[in-house]
């Protein structure tokens, strides 16, 4: 190899060892009967050398540094050449470095031809191995602007007082052009300006100077985003830290065309703007830091640009001003992550504060819009608390558990609407009366409606789930001893059409001791399946539940249990079941931890089934499933 550098070229070539390889014998640069591991060639020198091995790229790297002095004479502006040409260099990983020194008052602009640049964070690498490392200068201090790959949105970087640009090319890369030019500009009066151009939908992740280390004290950095007018941009902060400020406040400022409040100032912890049409600027302003404990300011953020959806221009009013103790959350439904670009899906408050989830609280009227390609990616979860603190005031009082129409009119699917029903302990109980009788969901007879009610205890220490119930069954009412949550969960978009079938009334009633009482009025010709609460986990210990089963005058009810034994093993106490005729009060008592379960039995009159649990040993729980079937009373079976 021969490398000759012209005089006055201000180029230095350095060949040195790269990352150690443990799989190859040492290799040397051989030059006039000497073997060396570092070779420096300066302007005006011509050196002939060889390598002592076949694959020097496994051992050595080459750095070509050109110093460009804009202090003492005119600056060589325009397209930057790769000198010496890559064809004249040994095939090693190469780094071309341009070090431009300029006066503080002179702005320097790096312009990147297509493909533009994409900033990468610490620990990331570029797929093709080509990286651009750009740094600036504040007095004598070097400031890292960032490391960039190809195929991005960054088209220009403006700095002042000097710039250092390092282009790293892997040994096998055929690139023979720098891909950028330098132009002079007037002073930019800040650390740097990064221009990011979007041609269409896409995203860009950008970072403050020196990231992940601290942004220079009291500095200003600006990003200019060029976005086609028909697209919308949203900003989200992925990661940030604040330093300890002595004077001034760290902030971001947006210049948004058309805004009457430019610049719009935000704290870093604020929700950042979304749904912005066209170009905008974002600036990061540091502060004077506390000398003793400065901390660090750093910011990593993402700009997402996408088509406005039809929904993004529609404003929905959610009037919760007459509601109390209610919160509505719109959030992404869980999905498997895909590797391809997925446009953002945001919900916006007052059209500007957009985020992937939003919680609205009662007592106000809210205006929301959506910036989302597919609203099925979002769902709604609502929580409302109905509580009674004074039992004298609440007794016999009723509340309708219905989804407000404002919520049903939103273009987002309702997932859960939960009512937390709270009563004073040992003073009142609750009764749920559905508009349409309910069916309990079982494996034998699953619910196939578009929604169900999930009923569970709302006492933190109590793990008690009464079950899932849907319209179209035989359960006329459910009485519960104490606090519960009732969740209307939807399973299909057709809920909107079936919404009229929802309707549940809760009333506060005098306190009773049983955990739950189900009133069942079976219809003829249909088998009613019923099961104990907490199916699969077992009825909680020492818990008692009852079923009040009505039998019409002209019918007979067949009560059938679906296993021979209950399977419960008691640690303390006894588990038992009482079947009691309501008219005669005649009752049969079964020891569930000892006896076999009764064979199918026939009942001519309404009857009770009461199941009370012991304290079972773990793994031997009490789970019972039974059915009730009505048949016409044609023969006197007695």
């Amino acid at each position: 190899f021969e490398i000759a550098l012209p005089r006055e070229s201000n180029i230095t070539v350095l060949i040195k060892l790269g990352t150690p390889t443990l799989l190859a014998k040492p290799c040397y640069i051989v030059i006039s009967k000497r073997h060396i591991t570092m070779l420096s060639i300066k302007s005006g020198e011509r050196i002939v050398f060889t390598f002592s091995c076949q694959s020097p790229e496994n051992h050595f790297v080459i750095e070509i540094q050109k110093n460009i002095d804009c202090m003492s004479g005119p600056c060589p502006f325009g397209e930057v050449q790769l000198q010496p040409s890559t064809s004249l260099l040994p095939t090693l990983n190469r780094t071309f470095i341009w070090d431009v020194k300029a006066h503080k008052s002179i702005g320097l602009e790096l312009q990147f031809s297509i493909p533009r640049l994409r900033q990468i964070g610490p620990g990331e690498s570029c797929p093709d191995g080509v990286t651009h490392s750009i740094s600036g200068r504040i007095d004598a201090t070097v400031v890292r602007i960032g490391t960039f790959c190809s195929n991005g949105t960054v088209s220009r970087i403006k700095m002042q007082e000097g710039v250092k640009m390092a282009l790293h090319l892997p040994w096998f890369h055929p690139r023979n052009v720098s891909g950028f030019s330098i132009a002079n500009r007037s002073s930019i009066k800040r650390l740097c300006i990064i221009e990011s151009v979007f041609e269409g939908e896409g995203s860009a992740t950008l970072m403050s100077a020196n990231y992940p280390e601290g942004f220079p004290e009291d500095e200003l950095m600006t990003w200019q985003f060029v976005v086609p007018a028909h697209l919308r941009a949203s900003v989200s902060f992925l990661n940030f830290n604040l330093s300890n400020c002595e004077r001034k406040e760290e902030r971001v400022e947006y210049y948004i065309p058309g805004s009457t409040t430019n610049p719009e100032v935000f704290k870093l912890e604020d929700k950042q703007p979304g749904n912005m049409a066209g170009n905008f600027n974002l600036s990061l302003q540091g502060c004077d830091q506390d000398a003793q404990s400065p901390g660090i300011l750093r910011l990593q953020f993402q700009v997402l640009v996408q088509h406005p959806q039809n929904e993004s221009n529609k404003i929905y009013v959610v009037d919760l001003s007459n509601e109390r103790a209610m919160s509505l959350t719109i959030e992404p439904r869980p999905v498997k992550q895909s590797r391809k670009f997925v446009p953002g899906c945001f919900v916006c408050l007052e059209s500007r504060t957009c985020s992937s989830n939003l919680t609205l609280t009662s007592g106000s009227k809210h205006k929301i819009s959506f910036l989302c390609d597919d609203l099925t990616r979002l769902w709604m979860n609502v929580e409302k608390t109905i509580s009674c603190t004074d039992h004298r005031y609440c007794q016999r009082k009723s509340y309708s558990l219905q989804v407000p129409s404002d919520i049903l009119h939103l273009p987002v699917e309702l997932h859960d609407f939960s009512w937390k029903l709270l009563v004073p302990k040992d003073r009142l109980s609750l009764v749920l009366v559905p508009a349409q009788k309910l069916q309990q969901h079982t494996h034998e007879k699953p619910c196939n409606t578009s929604f169900s009610y999930l009923v569970a205890s709302a006492i933190p220490s109590q793990d008690l789930y009464f079950g899932s119930f849907c319209p179209g069954g035989s359960i006329k009412q459910i009485q519960v001893k104490q606090n519960i949550s009732v969740t209307l969960r939807t399973f299909a978009p057709s809920f909107q059409q079936e919404a009229s079938r929802q309707g549940l009334t809760v009333s506060f009633i005098p306190y009773f001791k049983e955990e739950g009482v189900f009133t069942v009025t079976p219809d003829t010709k249909s088998k009613v399946y019923l099961r104990t609460p907490n199916w699969d986990r077992g009825l909680p210990s020492l818990t008692s539940v009852s079923w009040n089963i009505s039998v019409p005058r002209d019918q007979v009810a067949c009560l059938t249990f679906f296993k021979e034994r209950s399977g419960v093993v008691c640690q303390t106490g006894r588990a038992f079941m009482i079947i009691q005729e309501q008219r005669t009060r005649a009752e049969e008592i079964f020891s569930l931890d000892e006896d076999v379960l009764p064979k199918p039995s026939f009942h001519h009159h309404s009857f009770w089934v009461n199941i009370s649990n012991c304290s079972p040993t773990s793994g031997k729980q009490l789970d019972l499933l039974f059915s009730v079937t009505l048949t016409p009373r044609t023969v006197d079976l007695t």
Partner: antibody, heavy 118, light 106 residues
């Protein structure tokens, strides 16, 4: 098995010369440099120089340049170091080592003790 | 390139964690080796390329660092680890070594 064999001890008079040998075995002698190092009593290691048997090329520490000469005999896979104009300051143990993978001195001779005394 | 080792000597009990430091006056990449030299023996290679354990070296010897700051850690020192420890750079000529650290066992 890679081995570097050095002979035990040399007693020489001030002003004289000494030639120390280092016989390599168990690998291809031409593929790796031989490094020479000095260790005075109770002191750390000091690099004298190295030789590339393939190119017969040498590098020296400036401190020893002109007084130390490194050579090799490829036929016997032996490296030599000659030090001239010895003084009491040259009393030390001299090691040869192979510069192996990762540019690390992976195999060492047992050292030759040189005592310069009248 | 000047290599500076610290401390010059240290006395540790069996089972303790030992950290030896080696600083280079200039960037030497990862071309630093660590050697163990027991009394009246030649040095033995422990760590090559800053962090790679040499064949047969016990796992308690751990090398780390790059550029100018390097560390040899012995996670749980044993009686047989009594020795001098040297670091050296082979990034550029002339190759240089630190002054060594003498490890004594209490």
């Amino acid at each position: 098995e890679v081995q570097l064999q050095q002979f035990g001890a040399e007693l020489v008079k001030p002003g004289a010369s000494v030639k120390i040998s280092c016989k390599a075995s168990g690998y291809s002698f031409s593929d790796f440099n031989i490094e020479w190092l000095k260790q005075s009593h109770g002191k750390s290691l000091e690099w004298i120089g190295d030789i590339n048997p393939n190119y017969d090329s040498t590098n020296y520490n400036q401190k020893f340049k002109g007084r130390a000469t490194l050579t090799v005999d490829k036929s016997s896979s032996t490296a030599y170091m000659e030090v001239r104009s010895l003084t009491s300051e040259d009393t030390a143990v001299y090691y040869c080592a192979r510069l192996g993978y990762g540019y690390a001195m992976d195999y060492w001779g047992q050292g030759t003790s040189v005592t310069v005394s009248s | 390139i000047v290599m500076t080792q610290s401390p010059q000597s240290m006395s540790m009990s069996v089972g303790e964690r030992v950290t030896l430091s080696c600083k280079a006056s200039e960037n030497v990449g990862a071309y630093v080796s660590w050697f163990q030299q027991k009394p009246d023996q030649s040095p033995k290679l422990l760590i090559l390329a800053a962090s790679n354990r040499y064949t047969g070296v016990p796992a308690r010897f751990i090398g780390s660092g790059s550029a100018t700051d390097f560390t040899l850690t012995i996670s749980s020192v044993q009686a047989e680890d009594l020795a001098d420890y040297h670091c050296g750079q082979s990034y550029t000529y002339p190759y240089t070594f630190g002054g060594g650290t003498k490890l004594e066992i209490k």
